[in-house]
């Protein structure tokens, strides 16, 4: 059974992930982002189901395409370079989902814009955090 300290650690990691995703979303939704129209033409795979930490595998598999699309935006929209941002997210995701069990991600058929994709994973983080508090 998870201890209170491991639950607290998970919560903090999820909050960090949530902040990173929100920062990216705010950066691309910035009205000064002239590349938003182009960024919205790239489609992301969405999880069929995202209710547990193991489902973060679906996010992990989409981090490389996410980085490429973020590279289209002006770097001043973010505090960090996309490469560093994605690297940070990757570290958190790997810790959260664990590596003990190999989970095969199942994707929905509907694809999503970067905005829809980020919103979906923001909602996921918020949902898991609410169950931990």
């Amino acid at each position: 059974a998870p201890t209170s300290s491991s639950t607290k650690k998970t919560q903090l990691q999820l909050e960090h992930l949530l902040l990173d995703l929100q920062m990216i979303l705010n950066g691309i939704n910035n009205y000064k982002n002239p590349k938003l129209t182009r960024m919205l033409t790239f489609k992301f795979y969405m999880p069929k189901k995202a209710t547990e930490l193991k489902h973060l595998q679906c996010l992990e598999e989409e981090l490389k395409p996410l980085e490429e699309v973020l590279n289209l935006a002006q770097s001043k929209n973010f505090h960090l370079r996309p490469r560093d941002l994605i690297s940070n997210i990757n570290v958190i995701v790997l810790e959260l989902k664990g590596s003990e069990t190999t989970f095969m991600c199942e994707y929905a058929d509907e694809t999503a814009t970067i905005v829809e994709f980020l919103n979906r994973w923001i909602t996921f983080c918020q949902s898991i955090i609410s169950t931990l508090t």
């Epitope: 033409t41 790239f42 058929d109 509907e110 694809t111």
Partner: antibody, heavy 114, light 107 residues
């Protein structure tokens, strides 16, 4: 069941315009992007353009000046309009539901001839 | 635009042989690749989506592999009904370009 059905004029005179309707069922156009693809007789497949769920469009640069894709979500219909047709526009025109798994219509043959 | 180079353009193979068709994109397409089979007079039939996912009803002798820029369609043991033209298509960047096709014939 997902279905896409193209309906076109069959024959178009050179320099005239082409209008094709793609009627879909089994899903909503608010959830899926729709592409148009064509295939001239005995040749390969050529992507023409896409209409996104929100109604925005993206066209193959080779057709930008004479292609228009629109839709009516409530009628579950997508429309392709191409101007200034020439004989080399003779092809089967397909509409395709984009997604992780693309779904194709059966296509409609358009012949450009006097 | 993302270019997709498909090879070979034609292939003559014996029944039961293993067949490999490759598609190389001009840049990383992150597994946004589909493989189609087309027989004369028919619309293309989706075999594989997401580079590796076999569609329902497609025989298990078909498989897709690859990542990054390089992708492969394999038919482990060619059957008579596999005679067709095969196309790949990338879905990462618009325009969603196709490979030039591979015409498969029986030797």
């Amino acid at each position: 069941e997902v279905q896409l059905q193209e309906s076109g004029p069959g024959l178009v005179a050179p320099s005239q315009s082409l209008s094709i309707t793609c009627t879909v069922s089994g899903f909503s156009l608010t959830n899926y992007d729709i592409s148009w693809i064509r295939q001239p007789p005995g040749k390969g497949l050529e992507w023409l353009g896409v209409i996104w769920t929100g109604g925005g469009t993206n066209y193959n640069s080779g057709f930008m000046s004479r292609l228009s894709i629109t839709k009516d979500n409530s009628k579950s219909q997508v429309f392709l309009k191409m101007n200034s047709l020439q004989t080399d526009d003779t092809a089967i025109y397909y509409c395709v539901r984009q997604g992780r798994t693309p779904y194709w219509g059966n296509g409609t043959l358009v012949t450009v001839s006097a | 635009d993302i270019q997709v180079t498909q090879s070979p353009s034609s292939l003559s193979v014996s029944l039961g042989d293993r067949v490999t068709i490759t598609c190389k994109a001009s840049k990383d397409i992150y597994n946004r690749l589909a493989w189609y089979q087309q027989k004369p007079g028919n619309a293309p039939r989706l075999l594989i989506s997401g580079a590796t996912s076999l569609e329902t009803g497609v025989p298990s002798r078909f498989s897709g592999s690859g990542s990054g820029k390089d992708y492969t369609l394999t038919i482990t043991s060619l059957q008579t009904e596999d005679v067709a033209t095969y196309y790949c298509q990338q879905f990462w960047g618009t325009p969603y370009t196709f490979g030039g096709g591979t015409k498969l014939e029986i030797k």
